[in-house]
């Protein structure tokens, strides 16, 4: 947890989801009239998000503690997790309703179905994560979080299908980080860059986080990372070995989340 731009953040909260993203004026928060909010969204090739679009984004982890204009002059903000300083302890869209005065100043919630999406919260039994734009090169200045949450008792088997990120000795420029937890604070497994395929990873519990970051310069081919569910009964999930065996890394049992 931590503060960013005056907003209480946990990395599981997505900065954009399902094509929806938050924008504010260059002077800071709550400076846009309805017409200006609309123009900001249009400038970036989008439009003001509808209430339904904002709610769909909220359902997959979009959480912003700042009221903004939506389509049809509505104002509100999406809350995933209730908190004392935001959302009056409620979850859902905190809805200020349709504003009669369109000159009021708020932020903006935009929708762009063509925005290059990355990250999200995933509960599927298997899935492939790709760097934005794959198989084309990824862009500069990308930050993506993929949060996997399976059923209690299940584990996650991660395998790298394609991997090509800018190489530097400390992986300080572009990298993928894996965490054996539901955030990017606990259970750090490793940071990866370059073009060598990392070994498979099997989680200790039912949650895992992948973080992809690219800096402002060189880009490369990107990656595809696959995960599948390992059920409690299956052979590989019984392994207690914390060292690498074959091409799999087994993690010591530390984290398990409902």
């Amino acid at each position: 947890w931590g503060f960013k731009n005056g907003i209480f953040h946990n990395s599981i909260w997505l900065e954009q989801a399902a094509g929806v993203y938050h924008r504010e004026a260059r002077a800071g928060r709550y400076k846009l009239t309805y017409a200006e909010a609309k123009a900001v969204c249009e400038f970036e090739g989008g439009r003001l998000a509808t209430y339904k679009q904002l709610e769909a984004a909220r359902k997959i982890g979009f959480h912003v503690c700042a009221a903004g204009w939506m389509a049809k002059g509505r104002v509100g903000y999406p809350i995933v997790k209730p908190g004392p300083n935001c959302g009056f302890g409620k979850t859902g869209i905190i809805d200020y309703g349709i504003r009669l005065n369109r000159s009021e100043r708020w932020d903006a919630y935009c929708y762009n179905p063509h925005a290059k999406e990355c990250g999200g919260v995933f509960t599927d039994p298997k899935r492939i994560f790709k760097s934005p734009g794959f198989p084309n090169e990824y862009d500069d200045n990308q930050v993506c979080y993929w949060h996997i949450r399976l059923k209690y008792g299940q584990r996650i088997h991660l395998s790298f299908l394609d991997f090509d990120l800018e190489h530097d000795p400390g992986c300080l420029a572009d990298y993928v980080e894996i965490y054996d937890s539901y955030d990017d604070v606990h259970g750090f497994v490793g940071r990866y860059c370059g073009d060598e395929l990392p070994e498979d990873i099997i989680s200790t519990g039912n949650v895992m986080t992948l973080k992809f970051l690219s800096d402002a310069s060189v880009t490369a081919g990107g990656f595809q990372i696959k995960y599948v569910t390992v059920d409690p009964a299956s052979k590989s999930s019984q392994a207690k070995n914390t060292s690498t065996t074959g091409n799999k890394k087994f993690l010591p049992g530390r984290f398990s989340h409902l």
Epitope: R23, R26, A27, A35, E36, A39, V40, N141
Partner: antibody, heavy 120, light 112 residues
Framework: QVQLQQSGPELVKPGASVKLSCKTS????????INWVKQRPGQGLEWIGW????????KFNEKFKGMATLTVDTSSSTAYMELHSLTSEDSTVYFC?????????????WGQGTSVTVSS | DAVMTQTPLSLPVSLGDQASISCRST???????????LNWYLQKPGQSPQLLIY???NRFSGVLDRFSGSGSGTDFTLKISRVEAEDLGVYFC?????????FGGGTKLEIK
């Protein structure tokens, strides 16, 4: 689609004034500022200033203050720039361009330019 | 005023090559909110400038992903990954952090 249509070429005498127009279409005129830019061959581009049609506010490059007057007619979605006391230094092409000063997007769509010739 | 210096003045390239253009400011273009307002434009012969990149690295609507922008503070770069004939023209940067807005002198991209 967004369009900015500028008025035709102008031939004016030294010391006189000229009023250039920029008619816009395809977007909400009052939500974007209109910037004016001077482009002299071999000397690059110079920003003159902007006007925000929503409230008529302006922001100028000090170099052009007093020399350029920016106005708008919201009923016709048209912006105007009047240049005063013209000299041969002002003979060049002038562009209008749409911008979002309050978002910091800079300027996106440009007009085709108006050529001004100052000659006696 | 923030003086924008662009290099090189002329950039001869072969089609399919990567091109890189630099833009340097005499003062930081990061504002008090941590935002940096630096744009890149292409002006083809006889045409108006067209916006390619805004806020350092964001591609404008319809701009191909062969174009990418990077940098921070006072140093910025525009890269074109695989130059095509339609990319030829004069590229220039524009800073809109400080008033007056100021332009780079331009870089002419031409065929080698």
């Amino acid at each position: 689609q967004v369009q900015l249509q500028q008025s035709g070429p102008e031939l004016v005498k030294p010391g006189a004034s000229v009023k250039l127009s920029c008619k816009t279409s395809g977007y909400t005129f009052t939500s974007y500022d209109i910037n004016w830019v001077k482009q002299r061959p071999g000397q690059g581009l110079e920003w003159i200033g902007w006007i925000y049609p929503s409230d008529g506010s302006t922001k100028f490059n000090e170099k052009f203050k007093g020399m350029a007057t920016l106005t708008v007619d919201t009923s016709s979605s048209t912006a105007y720039m009047e240049l005063h006391s013209l000299t041969s230094e002002d003979s060049t092409v002038y562009f209008c361009a749409r911008g979002l000063w309050y978002y910091g997007g800079g300027v996106d769509y440009w007009g085709q330019g108006t050529s001004v010739t100052v000659s006696s | 005023d923030a003086v924008m210096t662009q290099t090189p003045l002329s950039l001869p390239v072969s089609l399919g090559d990567q091109a890189s253009i630099s833009c340097r400011s005499t003062q930081s273009l990061e504002d008090s909110n941590g935002n940096t307002y630096l744009n890149w434009y292409l002006q083809k012969p006889g045409q108006s400038p067209q916006l390619l990149i805004y806020r350092v690295s964001n591609r404008f609507s319809g701009v191909l992903d062969r174009f990418s922008g990077s940098g921070s503070g006072t140093d910025f770069t525009l890269k074109i990954s695989r130059v095509e004939a339609e990319d030829l023209g004069v590229y220039f940067c524009l800073q809109v952090t400080h008033v007056p807005y100021t332009f780079g002198g331009g870089t002419k991209l031409e065929i080698k």
